[in-house]
């Protein structure tokens, strides 16, 4: 589909650079051919990244803000293209490339899971919640008995270093816990984390990574969960988790246990009660959880299971017998 | 209640320099990220920088990078700007503002009643 | 440039409804991004009004109300008063900015007598 031609000779970018311009990310900046003659014509770019990850788009700008881990280094490449006649003619490629970081592999950490939660906020008289942010990871099998590890996160423009760490047996950071972020619980960016370490011995490779709010947000469970029996009907109410997220955006799992016969029943619902018909010779235990709908982010976690809540007569009534 | 004063400005040359200030009282400055919005004569607002509540992470706005700095001293529940290279076009009003982010896009809920800072020769 | 877009002005009568809009784009609000709203009374410094879309601080009136939709929100005001006479930012989120903070350029909103 790319067709030389010769009466339009296109020339591929000037200038191309990678420049670093935050955690797990990056700017890449060209300048059109000096020596292209075409001027008049609407000439695009094509920007290919060969690594990490594969991936190409077009743009008419002459610069491209990308999201991405750098530990492995980084790789691309822009042309110059021009639509023309149903065709596309393209320029031979300009490349640029970061090198991965120093370090041996296995001196960086490994399992890096992060988590984030939303908690009542004692200061905001506005917005009542705060969210907070807690990753672990293990130490990498290669590094030094010395080496120290240190966390940085990224949210949008905001990059803050740890201050709050959990140590092994050997005083090695191996976990961190931000109690208050500038993570947008209800937004839409990559929560990018960096875990970087130093030893006298060697250098310690940094490790990157990025995460999707919705896949790692922990979800509290539903509030004030009541249940109660009236005759052959149990009645379950509750009030939506401590989040950011409003009213209508839940998707609610209520469990009902049947403590005499061991049945359970596990209901999905959009609303904030249940009405289930029983047998009132049971006792019962309920529980409710709760999941952001996909109405409102993308499919995420379930919460843990609310506290159980006991109803019903507590003596076991032999079944009748005929 | 919380309380936002701003002082410092002044007039001063192209290419001077001048540091705001802004004291807080009401409410626990060390818990809460600040911010420096201005307001240019007759014109709208303009979001200038912000700072982390423990004053080590900073943002600024593509027009004031390299030349204004955004500090705090949280001992004096003290938020200040270090303004270098001024330029005619950095003639405003310049209020202080908490940050507020929690979980969202962030707002500045209270407000000083700004100090005048005008660059001219 | 990127930026949240106001009419400059709107005027309207004691008593009577007026809205004032904030148009955006796909990189602030057309991506979900919350939506907040200040007034600005002549000679003193501006005043959280609306946050997150259609949130009142305490203190502020319910004739104020706001509202989003695609890529714009607007600010509802009923019964119109003489001291809602002000000037009116709206203010949002843009991830194709180094700060992420955008305002509106304001609206001036003028009580008729």
């Known amino acids: 589909d790319l067709l030389p031609d010769d009466k339009i000779s296109l020339l591929p970018p000037v200038n191309f650079t990678i420049k670093v311009t935050g955690l797990a990310q990056v700017l890449l900046r060209w300048e059109p051919n000096p020596d292209q003659e075409q001027r008049n014509v609407n000439l695009e770019y094509q920007v290919k990244i060969n690594a990490p990850k594969e991936d190409d788009y077009e743009t008419r700008i002459t610069e491209s803000k990308c999201v991405t881990i750098l530990h492995k280094g980084f790789s691309a490449s822009v042309r110059t293209i021009l639509q023309k006649d149903h065709s596309l003619l393209a320029s031979s490629w300009a490349s640029a490339e970061l090198h991965a970081p120093p370090g041996s592999p296995g001196t960086s950490v490994v399992n890096l899971t992060c988590t984030t939660n939303t908690t009542a906020d004692n200061y905001s008289y506005l917005r009542p919640y705060q969210v907070s942010l807690h990753c672990t990871w293990l130490v990498g099998t290669d590094a030094p008995e010395d080496t120290q590890y240190f966390l940085y996160y990224r949210y949008g423009s905001w990059t803050e270093e740890c201050q709050e760490y959990s140590k092994d047996s050997m005083g090695r950071n191996i976990a961190c816990w931000f109690p208050r972020t500038f993570i947008h619980s209800r937004g839409r960016d990559w929560l990018a984390v960096l875990v970087n370490g130093s030893s006298k011995h060697s250098a310690i490779k940094p490790f990157d990574q990025l995460f999707a709010l919705h896949a790692i947000d922990q979800i509290n469970p539903p509030l004030n969960v009541t249940a109660e029996i009236k005759g052959t009907r149990l009645s379950i109410q509750w009030e939506k988790p401590v989040s950011a997220f409003p009213i209508h955006c839940f998707d609610y799992e209520v469990k009902i246990h049947n403590a005499r016969n061991g049945y359970l029943q596990i209901e999905k619902m959009m609303t904030n009660a249940f009405i289930s018909i029983i047998d009132d010779l049971s006792k019962y235990d309920v529980q409710v959880r709760a999941a952001v709908s996909s109405m409102c982010r993308e499919a995420g976690l379930w919460s843990e299971w609310s506290q159980p809540i006991y109803v019903g007569k507590d003596e076991h009534k032999p079944l009748r017998q005929w | 209640q919380v309380q936002l004063q701003e002082s410092g400005g002044g007039l001063v040359q192209p290419g001077g320099s001048l540091r705001l200030s802004c004291a807080a009282s009401?409410?626990?400055?060390?818990?809460?990220?600040m911010s420096w919005v201005r307001q240019a004569p007759g014109k709208g607002l303009e979001w200038v920088s912000a700072?982390?509540?423990?004053?080590?992470?900073?943002n600024y706005a593509d027009s004031v990078k390299g030349r204004f700095t955004i500090s705090r001293d949280n001992a004096k529940n003290t938020l200040y700007l270090q303004m270098n290279s001024l330029r005619a076009e950095d003639t405003a009003v310049y209020y202080c503002?908490?940050?507020?982010?929690?979980?969202?896009?962030?707002?500045?809920?209270?407000w000083g009643q700004g100090t005048m800072v005008t660059v001219s020769s | 440039q990127a930026g949240l877009t106001q009419p400059p002005s709107v005027s309207a009568a004691p008593g009577q409804r007026v809205t004032i809009s904030c148009s955006g784009s796909?990189?602030?609000?057309?991506?979900?991004?919350?939506v907040h709203w200040y007034q600005q009374v002549p000679g003193t410094a501006p005043k959280l009004l609306i946050f997150?879309?259609?949130n009142r601080p305490s203190g502020v009136p319910d004739r104020f109300s706001g509202s989003k939709s695609g890529t714009s929100a607007s600010l509802a005001i009923t019964g119109l008063q003489a001291e809602d006479e002000a000037d009116y930012y709206c203010?949002?989120?843009?991830?194709?900015?180094?700060?992420?903070?955008?305002f509106g350029g304001g609206t001036k909103l003028t009580v008729l007598r």
């Open positions: 700072i982390n509540s423990g004053g080590k992470s900073t």
């Open positions: 203010q949002s989120y843009d991830s194709s900015l180094s700060g992420h903070v955008v």
């Open positions: 997150d879309d259609n």
């Open positions: 503002a908490d940050y507020a982010t929690n979980y969202g896009v962030p707002y500045f809920g209270s």
């Open positions: 796909r990189s602030n609000i057309g991506s979900g991004y919350d």
């Open positions: 009401g409410f626990t400055f060390s818990n809460y990220a």
